[in-house]
């Protein structure tokens, strides 16, 4: 706490400039208004405060503003942005994506800070939900930020802002989000035609369920088998060999470099030897020619 | 044993409508896609319509969509091809068939539609 | 063809099909079976007498050793794009 000292003679700030880095902390407490500082903090980063004086200015607005500051003075933050804690940003009510972008740029190239994420779940909860403009902003500064949203969360992303997610953006997202995400991704570009379509629904597609795949080996996709690979387990496994065979297309003698690995193992265990070979490429593991396959989920119906 | 029994063709007027039915048995019908295909009285063989395994997706050749409509009751094992504004070139055995990827690996014996005044 | 023929029939596609080519047999009585699928790979209960072939836009089914049985219609679908297409036939008869 800094104490309270009257402002030396002739050292009252008319206005914010370069001559208050020379003011010692006491001297800056004094001597600005912080009604003046909240009108001209556009000048505040362009001026080479250090944190300690930083830290005044911080000080000043919070007694301006006990109950959080204004959207005027939010966006002209800059780094005394970094000064915020979570706790500050929560009383605060951020509309205008501009607000958010000046402040994201603040913190660009480094890793999401508390404040970050409570900025941006403040801003997106005023909002109602995660728009493509907001999505199209925060995707662009943190890829990974879709990702970092629970799958409650994802559920507010209408399904017009996923025209704003690139592949990137979904690189660390884990299957329960993609059980989310897929869905919206499909009615946002359900009027797409056949490899359009792929091409967007691509990197979604660790969501999709079995139906869905088998629909996609009708339109000549040719997947690779990155993307193979991360599709759901359950959804591949009742696929059958012709299905996979028209997925994959050219791609499909990739299976062989990747019978040991999931997906592609268990489906492997699901299929008949008899239709593993008819793919010619020695792919090893299926139900033995002879063997009956009992469906276990009608057996447990009508037990 | 895998069987595709299908029922309900007969005469029909010019512009009307019928109904047709395919019973299935002896294999897990919900996780196939399944296929209506006719053939005529000069015996061409025409595929006319594609359901999915759950029956979001349906697939129709420019000669009946519009006019044709595949669905299937899973409970049920039961696929249903609903046909209105039936014209005279309709006329053709129709035949239900299990679809394999890119293949119709099973057909039932079939059953005939006439459209004729 | 004679009993015991060498039998082959062929099947042009207007466009390359990706060897996405099937042969049906269709007895007189009506019946439909699939013999082979992708080309050259005999569908389960197929007897090893039939065999076929081809790539790009030519295909070709073979019966080595024609049977009594063997008497049908046969018939190639491409598969690999929609709308799914199937050729005219050709009517095996006995001599």
């Known amino acids: 706490e800094v104490e309270k000292t009257a402002c030396p003679s002739g050292k009252k700030a008319r206005e914010i400039d370069e001559s208050l880095i020379f003011y010692k902390k006491w001297e800056l407490e004094a001597c600005v208004d912080a009604a003046l500082l909240a009108t001209q903090m556009d000048r505040v980063n362009a001026i080479p405060f250090t944190y300690e004086q930083l830290d005044v200015l911080k000080h000043k607005l919070d007694e301006l503003y006990p109950q959080g500051y204004p959207e005027s003075v939010i966006q002209h933050l800059g780094y005394l942005f970094l000064k915020m804690s979570p706790e500050d940003i929560r009383k605060w009510n951020v509309t205008s994506l501009e607000t958010l972008k000046a402040l994201l740029e603040v913190n660009k190239g480094h890793e999401m800070s508390p404040q970050v994420a409570t900025l941006i779940d403040r801003f997106v909860k005023g909002r109602g939900q995660l728009d493509k403009d907001t999505l199209d902003t925060l995707t662009a500064f943190y890829p990974g930020y879709l990702c970092s949203l629970s799958p409650e969360e994802l559920s507010s992303v209408p399904p017009s802002s996923i025209w704003a997610v690139r592949p990137q953006d979904l690189d660390t997202c884990d299957p329960r989000q993609l059980d989310v995400l897929y869905p919206k991704a499909r009615l946002a570009f359900q009027n797409m035609n056949g490899s359009e379509y792929f091409v967007k629904i691509q990197s979604f597609l660790g969501g999709a369920p079995t139906e869905d795949l088998k629909a996609l080996s009708q339109q000549n996709v040719s997947m690779d088998l990155a993307t193979f690979m991360k599709l759901r387990t359950d959804a591949v496994l009742p696929l059958t060999v012709a299905e996979v065979q028209k997925l994959l297309g050219p791609h499909v003698e990739g299976l062989k470099a990747e019978e040991r690995h999931r997906p592609v193992r268990d489906w492997i265990l699901r299929q008949r030897q008899d239709d593993l070979d008819t793919l010619g490429l020695g792919l090893q593991g299926g139900i033995p020619n002879g063997y009956l396959v009992l469906d276990l989920s009608m057996q447990e119906a009508l037990s | 044993e895998l069987l595709l029994v299908e029922s309900g063709g007969g005469l029909v007027k010019p512009g009307g409508s019928l109904k047709l039915s395919c019973a299935a048995s002896g294999f897990t019908f919900s996780d196939y896609f399944m296929s209506w295909v006719r053939q005529t009285p000069e015996k061409r063989l025409e595929w006319v319509a594609t359901i999915s395994n759950g029956g979001t997706y349906t697939y129709y050749p420019d000669s009946v969509k519009g006019r044709f409509t595949i669905s299937k009751d899973n409970a049920k094992n039961n696929l249903y091809l609903q046909m209105s504004s039936l014209k005279s070139e309709d006329t053709a055995m129709y035949y239900c068939a299990r679809f394999d990827g890119y293949y119709f690996d099973y057909w039932g014996q079939g059953t005939t539609l006439t459209v004729s005044s | 063809a004679s009993l015991g023929d060498r039998v082959t029939i062929s099947c042009r596609a207007s466009?390359?099909?990706?060897?996405?080519l099937n042969w049906y047999q269709q007895k007189p009585d009506g019946t439909v079976k699939l013999l082979i699928y992708?080309?050259?790979r005999l569908h389960s209960g197929v007897p090893s007498r039939f065999s076929a072939s081809g790539s790009g836009t030519d295909y070709s089914l073979t019966i080595s050793n024609l049977e009594q049985e063997d008497i049908a219609t046969y018939f190639c679908q491409q598969g690999n794009t929609l709308p799914y297409t199937f050729g005219g036939g050709t009517k095996l008869e006995i001599k």
């Open positions: 466009q390359d099909i990706s060897n996405y």
């Open positions: 992708y080309t050259s």
